[in-house]
């Protein structure tokens, strides 16, 4: 045996975004003839020696990062990529809106705004029909992302989630769907790009805006955040209301 055994794959079916009390199955897949699978929940010191974990009803405590490996003889494989299992519906849904409106001409600009009454500092935007249906929705770690130079590829149904960086696997319920209609030439819908994480401050009422510029199918993002304190909010799970204004680079 030269080198380590190749890593298995780990996926959540039907999705890694799981509403509370709904079922989900985690499946670790290695090559044929594996002697032993080990499925681990990270940062909890717990594991199961099986390839499949069926969760009949999602709980907050089951949200988190998972990883699996397998053993052949005395050799262990490289670990799978980590799977982030997210519990949704933990908090009330945010609202998603389009500015100036959900109908936009091809080449025009539109801003998607995800607004929450809680003190969340993280937002996730999900576009239906993503070609990787079991992948987490894209997470946008900064609050301002207008879509510049819209193309027909941006047409579709969007939902957003909000959550706190303190509990990154406990998400709100999804917003009501927003149908973005782009008038102009027909283009095959494409996925939204992924933004790498960057820490941001907490706040009590926030607006997340999505901005994506496309140039020869390469995208950039421009970000800013405008936050208004809302002293009357006393049920914010992220703590007391504070006022911040931050602007991305």
């Amino acid at each position: 045996q030269s080198g380590p055994l190749p890593k298995p794959s780990l996926q959540a079916l039907p999705s890694s975004l799981v509403p509370l009390e709904k079922p989900v199955t985690l499946r670790c897949q290695g090559p044929p003839g594996v002697d032993l699978y080990r499925l681990e929940k990270l940062s909890s010191s717990r594991y199961q020696d099986q390839a499949v974990l069926f969760i009949p009803a999602m709980k907050r405590s089951l949200a988190g990062r998972y990883r699996c490996s397998y053993q052949n003889g005395s050799l262990w494989s490289l670990p799978s990529d980590q799977l982030e299992l997210v519990a949704t519906g933990v908090f009330a849904k945010p609202s998603l809106s389009a500015q100036p409106g959900p109908a936009v001409s091809s080449g025009g600009d539109v801003t998607l705004q995800c607004q929450t009454r809680y003190g969340f500092d993280q937002f996730a935007l999900y576009k239906e029909g993503d070609p990787a249906p079991y992948k987490n929705p894209e997470r946008w770690y900064r609050a301002s992302f207008p879509i510049i130079t819209v193309t027909a590829a941006h047409s579709g149904t969007y939902r957003c989630y909000s959550f706190s960086s303190r509990d990154p696997y406990l998400w709100s319920a999804p917003s009501d769907p927003l149908e973005l209609v782009v008038t102009g030439t027909s283009v095959t819908p494409s996925r939204l790009p992924t933004e790498p994480p960057s820490p941001v401050a907490e706040f009590s009422e926030a607006t997340a805006e999505l901005t994506v510029s496309f140039t020869n199918e390469v995208f950039t993002t421009e970000t800013s955040r405008s936050i208004t304190a809302s002293p009357k909010e006393s049920d914010s799970p992220a703590g007391p209301a504070r006022q911040y204004y931050t602007k991305g680079n």
Epitope: S43, S45, Y47, D49, L53, Q71, W76
Partner: antibody
Framework: QVQLVESGGGLVKPGGSLRLSCAAS????????VSWIRQAPGKGLEWVSA????????QYAESVKGRFTISRDNAKNSLYLQMNSLRAEDTAVYYC????????????????WGQGTLVTVSS | QSVLTQPPSVSGAPGQRVTISCTGS?????????VHWYQQLPGTAPKLLIY???NRPSGVPDRFSGSKSGTSASLAITGLQAEDEADYYC???????????FGGGTKLTVL
């Protein structure tokens, strides 16, 4: 209450063999991972081997691989460690320890330990 | 040589606070595995003191606390008492070969 009692230790010559036993009581033995952990005189703890509840999942430290064999008999609530080709550096107190378990999950720590049995390898 | 690194000894006067560090690597503590602590009183078997970085089993006084950050962890003991004199071991798991790993142990002396 949970109890783990080791036995079988003693003096053995280098190259010799010894079989340690650990008698478990006070819990459903077959549901738990158990390990052997040793401590050389005046030294620290060293994990030796672990075995899953059914006996099919076994793991060994590199220092004993190929020489030691862990096994269990759930009907007898017993854990075993067959030690062959013993060396002077295997001299230690050998503890059996239970891994914590909750619902379907096993945990990577030891919640109960036996009192240990001393193995001395010397000519 | 142990996979996890602890100071060989620490000491403190009764009533004082002492901390014991435990340093690992990206394949154990830094790989998402928790750190657990055991107390071994002279002539006895080890006893679980802290599990899951910072949790105390029932019966363990709240003078004992644990924390973890990155690839290291620490055990803090406040209000030192004579009966705390013992060896303390940290333990975690290593992803490379899925083995259980210990620190070399720290002898606590109460002055």
């Amino acid at each position: 209450q949970v109890q783990l009692v080791e036995s079988g230790g003693g003096l053995v010559k280098p190259g010799g063999s010894l079989r340690l036993s650990c008698a478990a009581s006070g819990f459903s033995f077959g549901d738990y991972y158990v390990s052997w952990i040793r401590q050389a005189p005046g030294k620290g703890l060293e994990w030796v081997s672990a075995i899953g509840g059914s006996g099919s999942a076994v793991q060994y430290a590199e220092s004993v691989k190929g020489r030691f064999t862990i096994s269990r008999d759930n009907a007898k609530n017993s854990l075993y460690l067959q030690m062959n080709s013993l060396r002077a550096e295997d001299t230690a107190v050998y503890y059996c320890a239970r891994h914590y378990r909750e619902f379907r999950w096993h945990y990577y720590y030891f919640d109960y330990w036996g009192q240990g049995t001393l193995v001395t390898v010397s000519s | 040589q142990s996979v996890l690194t602890q100071p060989p000894s620490v000491s403190g006067a009764p009533g004082q606070r002492v901390t014991i560090s435990c340093t690992g690597s990206s394949s154990n503590i830094g790989a998402g595995y928790d750190v657990h602590w055991y107390q071994q009183l002279p002539g006895t078997a080890p006893k679980l003191l802290i599990y899951g970085n910072s949790n105390r089993p029932s019966g363990v006084p709240d003078r004992f606390s644990g924390s973890k950050s990155g690839t290291s962890a620490s055990l803090a003991i406040t209000g030192l008492q004579a009966e705390d004199e013992a060896d303390y071991y940290c333990q975690s798991h290593d992803l490379g070969a899925h083995v259980w790993v210990f620190g070399g142990g720290t002898k606590l002396t109460v002055l």
